[in-house]
């Protein structure tokens, strides 16, 4: 015959543990039910009554099966340099990540404690290492035969066009200018971008018309949507 299924609360067999989604209550010395995510233990179990669970209040949560007396408080509202990527619900904490053009300079267990604006590379310099969610942009000087004419956190150095006859030679911050109407070989028009990480934005496209107010997720300084060291003395 199959073993009889015990209903909580029940005394466990010596040496055995409580089942999944149950916990051992030291006071009652019984296996008792845990509360589901989004709930907490309002009344702990006794030898004759199981745990009484209640829903988490607003702005509090429990993410796991638990027997905590109070739900955890959700984190504070996301700061102006961040975007709320996960809302506070009864079952999950709020998660804030850096908005486009920023990276996480100081992480916390989930999300980001402090964002900083991505540096940009000035003309004559291209992106050697793009910004990521947790690291700043690294720039490098454009090598001979390449150029960048933008101030950008995404553009790399790209080759000068090759002319039949050069009118103006290219340099690190300017493409070559050809005398003939068409060069023998040229790059496709437009800036070359590195793959754009979640935390960067294009520095070139101008919306038309320009909006006069920022969306609620946008910041400054840097103040931002933009923002947050330097060659030899960088941070």
């Amino acid at each position: 015959l199959p073993a009889q299924v015990a209903f909580t609360p029940y005394a466990p067999e010596p040496g055995s543990t409580c089942r999944l989604r149950e916990y051992y209550d030291q006071t009652a010395q019984m296996c008792c039910s845990k509360c589901s995510p989004g709930q907490h233990a309002k009344v702990f179990c006794t030898k004759t009554s199981d745990t009484v669970c209640d829903s988490c209040e607003d702005s509090t949560y429990t993410q796991l099966w638990n027997w905590v007396p109070e739900c955890l408080s959700c984190g504070s509202r996301c700061s102006s340099d961040q975007v709320e990527t996960q809302a506070c619900t009864r079952e999950q904490n709020r998660i804030c990540t850096c908005r486009p053009g920023w990276y996480c300079a100081l992480s916390k267990q989930e999300g980001c404690r402090l964002c900083a604006p991505l540096r940009k590379c000035r003309p004559g310099f291209g992106v050697a290492r793009p910004g990521t969610e947790t690291s700043d942009v690294v720039c490098k000087p454009c090598a001979p035969g390449t150029f960048s004419n933008t101030t950008s956190s995404t553009d790399i150095c790209r080759p000068h066009q090759i002319c039949n006859v050069v009118a103006i030679p290219g340099n690190a911050s300017m493409d070559a200018v050809c005398t003939s109407t068409s060069p023998t070989r040229s790059m496709a028009p437009g800036a070359v971008h590195l793959p754009q990480p979640v935390s960067t934005r294009s520095q070139h496209t101008q919306p038309t018309p320009e909006p006069s107010t920022a969306p609620s997720t946008s910041f400054l300084l840097p103040m931002g949507p933009s923002p947050p060291a330097e060659g030899s003395t960088g941070d």
């Epitope: 700061s79 102006s80 340099d81 053009g101 300079a105 100081l106 404690r113 402090l114 900083a116 604006p117 540096r119 940009k120 590379c121 000035r122 004559g124 310099f125 720039c139 490098k140 000087p141 933008t150 101030t151 950008s152 934005r201 294009s202 520095q203 070139h204 496209t205 101008q206 919306p207 320009e210 909006p211 006069s212 107010t213 920022a214 969306p215 609620s216 997720t217 946008s218 910041f219 400054l220 300084l221 840097p222 103040m223 931002g224 949507p225 933009s226 923002p227 947050p228 060291a229 330097e230 060659g231 030899s232 960088g234 941070d235």
Partner: antibody, heavy 124, light 110 residues
Framework: EVQLVESGGGLVQPGGSLRLSCAAS????????INWVRQAPGKGLEWVGI???????NFANWAKGRFTISRDNSKNTLYLQMNSLRAEDTAVYYC??????????????????WGQGTLVTVSS | DIQMTQSPSSLSASVGDRVTITCQAS??????LAWYQQKPGKAPKLLIY???ILTSGVPSRFSGSGSGTDFTLTISSLQPEDFATYYC????????????FGGGTKVEIK
């Protein structure tokens, strides 16, 4: 030489409007975040607002709804439109580039250069 | 909204003195802090960015330190041309900003 020059200041009556200009030379306005900062006579610096490279704008809480920032890329000029002016808006208004250049990097969180400023007086 | 509290609001010092100005942020701003010098009738001039990096052309007697919420501007040996007002500025110009500047510190001749 990288330079910003403000213009358009003057005397205006309370409730009136004024549009300030900030002309850039030596760099393209559209590739930098540009800020407006003001300074009332004998007082400290007060941030007014910013226009980011993408054209989005942000303002100090006290300036929202009354001030707007726009940009004319063809003229390489920035504008600050101020409406419903009050006596407490009397100040020198500066434009400042968000982006200090160093070692190939641009730091958008530092303001450099600044214009020379233009005085706005709101009085009846 | 990050608030910057600068102290002292004014100080008197003599040429050659070591001068220290502090700036406290109401919440952590990492190293996103700049210092400016302003002389009467002139626009502010950037001295230090990212808390401790000196801008080109600024004398080495100026130095910046700090991270998080507490920052310091130090002038190791005050010179006659250093008498001015100094401002700190945090690097966040977001959606809930009242001001990004501290209240200023006026350095006067004793």
């Amino acid at each position: 030489e990288v330079q910003l020059v403000e213009s358009g200041g003057g005397l205006v009556q309370p409730g009136g409007s004024l549009r300030l200009s900030c002309a850039a030379s030596g760099f393209s306005l559209s590739t930098y975040d540009i800020n407006w900062v003001r300074q009332a006579p004998g007082k400290g610096l007060e941030w007014v607002g910013i226009i980011y490279t993408g054209g989005i704008t942000n303002f100090a809480n006290w300036a929202k709804g009354r001030f707007t920032i726009s940009r004319d890329n063809s003229k390489n000029t920035l504008y600050l439109q101020m409406n419903s002016l009050r006596a407490e808006d009397t100040a020198v208004y500066y434009c400042a580039r968000g982006g200090y250049d160093s070692e190939g990097y641009v730091y958008p969180d530092a303001f450099d250069p600044w214009g020379q400023g233009t005085l706005v007086t709101v009085s009846s | 909204d990050i608030q910057m509290t600068q102290s002292p609001s004014s100080l008197s010092a003599s040429v050659g003195d070591r001068v220290t100005i502090t700036c406290q942020a109401s919440e952590s701003i990492s190293n996103l802090l700049a210092w400016y010098q302003q002389k009467p009738g002139k626009a502010p001039k950037l001295l230090i960015y990212r808390a401790s990096i000196l801008t080109s052309g600024v004398p080495s007697r100026f130095s910046g330190s700090g991270s998080g919420t507490d920052f310091t501007l130090t002038i190791s040996s005050l010179q006659p041309e250093d008498f001015a007002t100094y401002y700190c500025q945090h690097g966040y110009t977001g959606t809930n900003v009242q001001n990004v500047f501290g209240g200023g510190t006026k350095v006067e001749i004793k």
